[in-house]
């Protein structure tokens, strides 16, 4: 089952999947002036490889492209990388059966990757450079099914401007000693949910992240 909504935003942080679960979809998006081949609308993680390779061809008319496919129109876009420079995946890729690695870039690829995650997917959070990580628990969010709905758990990470770190020493000590209560996995509350409420915005892009870098 596809996850509704995006992984939660953590101010001044970025998230990344170390590997992608079977069924994950990546839109074939092309940069301005290029369009995807009609038959290559998206890539899907099948087993531990991607079903096809995205391709972009020159588009002299520069027609506006649909952001999502008809099959996925009802799903919210889930973007995990940047609007101006894709962060490079480094070292930590898991190689598990039923999981795919980060697909290699394709020629004329859009700077923003739009993923559609599936239940059970986890994403790892890190503070963007310039921000110090204050961690109270795992900096991970997992898409879980609860009471018939998918939602993301809240990562235990706060990012503070490193240039102001002297102002945060007291709060860092108190946050470090605080234990975050584990989520209730069994009960289904009538009016509330363990999942953070989805926001109107999609997952944080690096444009936003970097604009916020020293704010």
């Amino acid at each position: 089952e596809l996850c509704l909504y995006d992984p939660p935003e953590v101010p001044n942080a970025t998230f990344k999947a170390l590997s992608y679960k079977n069924g994950t979809i990546l839109n074939c998006e092309c940069k301005r002036g290029f369009r995807r081949l009609k038959e290559l609308v998206y890539m899907r993680c099948l087993g531990n490889s991607w079903s096809s390779n995205c391709q972009c061809t020159s588009n002299s008319h520069d027609k506006s492209r649909k952001q999502v496919t008809a099959q996925l129109e009802h799903q919210k876009e889930q973007q995990t990388t940047t609007d101006m420079q894709k962060p490079t995946q480094s070292m930590h890729q898991e190689n598990l059966t039923g999981h795919c690695r980060e697909p290699p870039p394709w020629k004329h690829e859009d700077s923003k990757r739009i993923y559609h995650f599936v239940e059970g997917q986890s994403v790892h959070y890190e503070c963007i450079p310039g921000y110090k990580a204050l961690q109270r628990g795992p900096a991970i969010s997992i898409c879980k099914m609860k009471c018939g709905k998918t939602g993301w758990t809240q990562p235990q990470l706060t990012c503070v401007d490193e240039r102001e770190h002297h102002r945060f020493l007291a709060s860092e000590e108190s946050q470090g000693s605080r234990n975050s209560s584990p989520e209730s996995e069994t009960s289904c509350p009538i009016t509330t949910t363990d999942f953070p409420q989805p926001t109107e915005t999609t997952a944080m892009t690096e444009t936003f992240v970097l604009t916020m870098e020293y704010k």
Epitope: M91, E126, G130, Y131, A133, L134, K215
Partner: antibody, heavy 114, light 107 residues
């Protein structure tokens, strides 16, 4: 006291490789993003690369993309810059800094010349 | 890439002077500009971050202002130990870019 100590610089021929290290102490290394900045002789400062606190995301200037690799070993409190296919224009003093540039090392000189 | 145009390139000043230098970004960078001091033979030091915030331990004679594309750095009551090259840097988007520097020299 925060300390960043670079090492690994030296004279290298064009096309060859060099790996710089930056040993960090006096702060919780794994909580901080890190960066490399270089300065060619008598020139200004030029950002080279940055890495997030856990090493998942890396960022590079275009002229070094595909040739340089920034990485880190949080267990050893060390930042690295692997430099391949070096060019004469890479000649510079390379500084290691925290991601917000509040702390800098003393720099290590890399000279690329035949 | 965002180009940071710094002016002037150099200035001849006297102790006690008020020194002002400027940085102009080629596009809007909000308040994401920092100022650094680099003395001969030393590594750079952060003085001002986010356009106007003085970093810990930096004397209050150093001030910064501006937002959007135009930024100003001022040294009030210039001291001999302030002789250095000063750089602005935009931290709004990658690639991070520095100005070319302003060198302060004694008259």
């Amino acid at each position: 006291e925060v300390q960043l100590v670079e090492s690994g610089g030296g004279l290298v021929q064009p096309g060859r490789s060099l790996k710089l290290s930056c040993a960090a102490s006096g702060f919780t290394f794994s909580d901080y993003g890190m960066a490399w900045v270089r300065q060619a002789p008598t020139k200004g400062l030029e950002w080279v690369a940055s890495i997030t606190n856990g090493g998942l995301n890396t960022y590079y200037r275009d002229s070094v993309k595909g040739r340089f690799t920034i990485s880190r070993d949080n267990a050893k409190c060390t930042l690295y810059l692997q430099m391949d296919s070096l060019r004469s224009e890479d000649t510079a003093t390379y500084y290691c800094a925290t991601g917000g540039f509040s702390f800098w090392g003393q720099g290590t000189l890399v000279t690329v010349s035949s | 890439d965002i180009v940071m145009t710094q002016s002037p390139t150099s200035m001849s000043i006297s102790v006690g002077d008020r020194v002002t230098m400027n940085c102009k970004a080629s596009q809007n960078v909000d308040s994401n500009v920092d100022w650094y001091q680099q003395k001969t033979g030393q590594s750079p030091k952060l003085l001002i971050y986010k356009a106007s915030n003085r970093y810990t331990g930096v004397p209050d004679r150093f001030t910064g202002s501006g937002s959007g594309t135009d930024f100003t750095f001022t040294i009030r009551n210039m001291q001999a130990e302030d002789l250095a090259v000063y750089y602005c840097m935009q931290s709004n988007s990658y690639p991070l870019t520095f100005g070319s520097g302003t060198k302060l020299e004694i008259k």
